[in-house]
Every structure is written in structure tokens, then in C-alpha cells.
């Protein structure tokens, strides 16, 4: 369960892949598309508002127990739109929604080597946001083998003005 309804902190950042491709958001036919692309030098990186939440980590041994704390995030590239996991389609989509946000909008934030992070679906443990065919997709990861897979590693570059949207 998410401990507080309000975030513990917020941060404005640009999001890129391990291989330094930018995650960009484009309005097309009244809906937003998400792209993974090489940015031209003069083009500004798209900003994402990250809202951080403190959450209880459920115990693996007893389903009703608690095993410590974890950090969750929601990601909003533009007002009233949030990244959401579509577990049926194995896709990552931008949806307009009101608060309280659905569980599909929450991702466990993992601290990785090489100054990278990973985003794990709250609704589907072991499934991470990843890059597939120049798009974001949901990728199942076997912990004991592929936790370092480059396609689930992302870089966050903080932008210091907090003017979002």
C-alpha cells in the first residue's frame, strides 16, 4: 500500500535510455504517443514530472506481511496525463486521468549501477518498463539473470526549474 496520498517529493527530469536515446512525447490525433529516439542537437529534451511515494513492500513469505519500505513513482510528461502500464498489451501508454491515480500509474523505482534507474510495474511484479523497437514496452525480467539488462535501464537528468506543463 502507498503510505501517503501525497508524494514525499517531486522532481522535473528528462528521461533517456541507457544508450542515451531520448524518451519523447507527441500529441497525435488527440492522444499522446511515446517515442524512443536520437534527438537532434538543438532540440530540447521533453520533461517529465516524477512524483515520489513511500510504500510498504509486501512480504514474499506471507502475503499479508510487510517487508520494509520501497519508493514508487508516477511519471507525468504533461498536465493531467500519466504513464500507465497496460499489462494485457504489454505496453506503456499515456492516459489522461484524475487523482487518485490508478495502480497502473505507479512504478517501483529501482536504483541501478551506471547512474541508472528501472521502473517496475506496481500491478505486475517482475515486469519493467523497457525499450523494444524504438518504443516503450513492458518487459518481464528474471531477477536471477537479467536484472542488468540494458533495455530496462534509464537515465534521469534533473531539470532544476519546477515549472511543469
Amino acid at each position: 500500500s502507498i503510505t501517503g496520498i501525497s508524494p514525499i517529493t517531486e522532481s522535473l527530469a528528462s528521461l533517456s535510455t541507457y544508450n542515451d536515446q531520448s524518451i519523447t512525447f507527441a500529441l497525435e490525433d488527440e492522444s499522446y504517443e511515446i517515442y524512443v529516439e536520437d534527438l537532434k542537437k538543438d532540440k530540447k529534451k521533453d520533461k517529465v514530472l516524477l512524483s515520489y511515494y513511500e510504500s510498504q513492500h509486501p512480504s514474499s513469505e506471507s502475503g499479508d506481511g510487510v517487508d520494509g519500505k520501497m519508493l514508487m513513482v508516477t511519471l507525468s510528461p504533461t498536465k493531467d496525463f500519466w504513464l500507465q502500464a497496460n499489462n494485457k498489451e504489454h505496453s506503456v501508454e499515456l492516459h489522461k486521468c484524475e487523482k487518485p491515480l490508478p495502480d497502473q500509474a505507479f512504478f517501483v523505482l529501482h536504483n541501478r549501477s551506471f547512474n541508472c534507474v528501472s521502473f517496475e510495474c506496481k500491478t505486475d511484479p517482475g515486469v519493467f518498463i523497457g525499450v523494444k523497437d524504438n518504443h516503450l514496452a513492458l518487459i518481464k525480467v528474471d531477477y536471477s539473470e537479467n536484472l542488468g539488462s540494458e533495455n530496462i535501464l534509464f537515465k534521469l537528468s534533473e531539470i532544476h526549474h519546477h515549472h511543469h506543463h
Epitope: I8, T9, E10, S11, L12, A13, L50, Y52, E54, H57, S59, S60, E61, D67, G68, K69, M70, L71, V108, L109, H110, N111, R112, S113, V117, Y143, S144, E145, N146, L147, G148, L156, E158
Partner: antibody, heavy 119, light 111 residues
Framework: EVQLVESGGGLVQPGGSLRLSCAAS????????MSWVRQAPGKGLEWVAT????????DYVDSVKGRFTISRDDSKNTLYLQMNSLRAEDTAVYYC????????????WGQGTLVTVSS | EIVLTQSPATLSLSPGERATLSCRAS??????????LNWFQQKPGQPPRLLIF???NRGSGIPARFSGSGSGTDFTLTISSLEPEDFAVYYC?????????FGQGTKVEIK
């Protein structure tokens, strides 16, 4: 209940070797980053080494690089610290620690095992 | 490496009093908009126990009398009203970057 139990400490001569073990229970061991933190008698805490979940990455404090090796056996739920070329300044209580889920901070600590390096 | 300096080295207080402990970092411990500064309590013969993570968030089972604040390089641990079991050594620690470093500790002792 989440538990970490260290073993393998003892008295060893300078230049000698020792292998510490940490038996983990009560959680899905392979999903968590694990570390060793030490504390010299009457002194403060010093991080020694970390190994990520999935055995992908390891990191060490400079003073033990090339001498200590952190490893894990996820099938046995066990963390190890192989210590070679031991020095008097390695004398300390060695704690096994588990990161929180997501690897942001040391969340769970074992009771520690004492390593004494002396001739 | 990031050096953490705690003050005071020793704090002599009575049960019921308020304790304010300081931790200063040699450079910012902020990353991704998070202040990656944690606080631990250690009693004699025991391992450390996580009190506060990410500057201001209580660990599991930590009483509300413990609170953390601060950002950038300056952080504070406050114990609003000291209980007998709170007399111990307190360490701050940064998890922004390797090598992960600890402060030298503040001992809270009974006056």
C-alpha cells in the same frame, strides 16, 4: 521473519585469509542487493562491498579492492565475503546488510561476526 | 568521496527532552530529486537499525517521535521527546554514490 545470520569470523594472522558467510531467510534473496559493512572496535561504521540482485554488479571500498571478493549463491540464499591478504586494520565486526526493495538504503542488518587480524 | 560530519559528538540530555542531531555533507547528496541521506541508531552490542531514509521518511516500525529533515548538504534528526531506550549512537549515511559513507556518529547519553 526477515533474518540475516553471519558466520566465519575468528582470529587470523596478518596476510591470512577468511571467508565470511551470511545466511538469509524470510525474503526472496535473489531480488535484493546485499552488502557488507564493518565496524572496528569502538569506532564508526564503514561500508565494505555491495553485490546487486542478479549478481550483475559489485562495488568495493578502495581499501579492500583486490583483496576482498563479495559473492552470492542465490540457490543457497547465502552471501559471502572472501577476505585475502588480511591486515590489522581489517579487524572489525562485519555486518551483512540487505538493501530495501529497489536498492536505495541499508534496511536489514545481521548481528555481525568478529574478525580479528593479529599475530 | 562524500564526507559526512556529525555534530555534536556527544549530546547529554534527560528523558523527555528534545534531541537535535546534525549531519553535514561535503557535497550535495541529492540525486533524481531525492535526498539520499539515511539515519541509523546503534545500541551497545547490537547492529545498527534504520530510522530514517531519504532524509525524512521513517523506516518500518519506527516511532513518530523520530523525524528527519534537510536537503542538499544539511540534515537534521530530531527526537521530539527522548525515551529511555533512545540513548544510543546515531549515524547518518549517504547512498548517493559509491563509496557509501557514514558520519562518525553522535552519542546521545543520559544527563
Amino acid at each position: 521473519e526477515v533474518q540475516l545470520v553471519e558466520s566465519g569470523g575468528g582470529l587470523v594472522q596478518p596476510g591470512g585469509s577468511l571467508r565470511l558467510s551470511c545466511a538469509a531467510s524470510g525474503f526472496t534473496f535473489s531480488s535484493f542487493s546485499m552488502s557488507w559493512v564493518r565496524q572496528a572496535p569502538g569506532k564508526g561504521l564503514e561500508w565494505v562491498a555491495t553485490i546487486s540482485g542478479g549478481k550483475t554488479f559489485t562495488d568495493y571500498v578502495d581499501s579492500v579492492k583486490g583483496r576482498f571478493t563479495i559473492s552470492r549463491d542465490d540457490s543457497k540464499n547465502t552471501l559471502y565475503l572472501q577476505m585475502n591478504s588480511l591486515r590489522a586494520e581489517d579487524t572489525a565486526v562485519y555486518y551483512c546488510t540487505r538493501a530495501n526493495y529497489g536498492n536505495w538504503f541499508f534496511e536489514v542488518w545481521g548481528q555481525g561476526t568478529l574478525v580479528t587480524v593479529s599475530s | 568521496e562524500i564526507v559526512l560530519t556529525q555534530s555534536p559528538a556527544t549530546l547529554s540530555l534527560s528523558p523527555g527532552e528534545r534531541a537535535t542531531l546534525s549531519c553535514r555533507a561535503s557535497e550535495s547528496v541529492a540525486k533524481y530529486g531525492l535526498s539520499l541521506l539515511n539515519w541509523f541508531q546503534q545500541k551497545p552490542g547490537q547492529p545498527p537499525r534504520l530510522l530514517i531514509f531519504a532524509a525524512s521518511n521513517r523506516g518500518s516500525g519506527i516511532p513518530a517521535r523520530f523525524s528527519g529533515s534537510g536537503s542538499g548538504t544539511d540534515f537534521t534528526l530530531t527526537i521530539s521527546s527522548l525515551e529511555p531506550e533512545d540513548f544510543a549512537v546515531y549515524y547518518c549515511q549517504q547512498s548517493k554514490e559509491v563509496p557509501f559513507t557514514f558520519g562518525q556518529g553522535t552519542k546521545v547519553e543520559i544527563k
